[in-house]
């Protein structure tokens, strides 16, 4: 049984300066841990690269909306 108390926490210390095309994005996850200095979004690209982004930025929010909507559309 893994010890959740000692589980490593992923944090973002810097955000990307560049807007990423939604066509390059595969998924995201939110960093909301109080152990991290900043609230953040980690986008995973279609080539499995992870990029930290600022959830306050509109392009980040729009990209999360786009990815959310994709999850309710059956992939054919």
């Amino acid at each position: 049984q893994p010890d959740a108390i000692n589980a490593p926490v992923t944090c973002c210390y810097n955000f990307t300066n560049r807007k990423i095309s939604v066509q390059r994005l595969a998924s995201y996850r939110r960093i909301t841990s109080s152990k991290c200095p900043k609230e953040a979004v980690i986008f995973k690209t279609i080539v499995a690269k992870e990029i930290c982004a600022d959830p306050k930025q509109k392009w980040v929010q729009d990209s999360m909306d786009h990815l959310d909507k994709q999850t309710q559309t059956p992939k054919t």
């Epitope: 998924s27 995201y28 996850r29 939110r30 909301t32 609230e39 979004v41 959830p55 306050k56 980040v60 929010q61 729009d62 999360m64 909306d65 990815l67 959310d68 909507k69 999850t71 309710q72």
Partner: nanobody, 123 residues
Framework: EVQLVESGGGLVQAGGSLRLSCAAS????????MGWFRQAPEKEREFVAV????????FYSNSVKGRFTISRDNAKNTVYLQMNSLKPEDTAVYYC????????????????WGQGTQVTVSS
């Protein structure tokens, strides 16, 4: 951490209307997908409606489509659920939730939940 407080519930006759509000405090409201869920006695919590961060897209369960409208005001950190043509089967505790993880209508993708507000529709 996001705190959510619902209001606007109450007792209403069938065919009536109610408007629920959910006020958020804490982290950036506009960075969360917002949803409404409900739980009737002896039943599972069920999805009602969701709205995107921008507010441009909404999605409803089949049971409320055409009767309920979800909206949000990012300047006021508030999400609303306008409920019209209410039916006795709409009786439930209604919960507001903030979705931080990728998803849409699945409760498991919502990280933050309010305490709920009771809606009772009498026949």
């Amino acid at each position: 951490e996001v705190q959510l407080v619902e209001s606007g519930g109450g007792l209403v006759q069938a065919g009536g209307s109610l408007r629920l509000s959910c006020a958020a405090s804490g982290r950036t409201f506009s960075s969360y997908r917002m949803g409404w869920f409900r739980q009737a006695p002896e039943k599972e919590r069920e999805f009602v409606a969701v709205i995107t961060r921008s507010g441009s897209d909404q999605f409803y369960s089949n049971s409320v489509k055409g009767r309920f409208t979800i909206s949000r005001d990012n300047a006021k950190n508030t999400v609303y659920l306008q409920m019209n043509s209410l039916k006795p089967e709409d009786t439930a505790v209604y919960y507001c939730a903030a979705g931080a993880q990728i998803g849409w209508a699945e409760a498991s993708t919502y990280d933050y939940w309010g305490q709920g507000t009771q809606v009772t529709v009498s026949s």
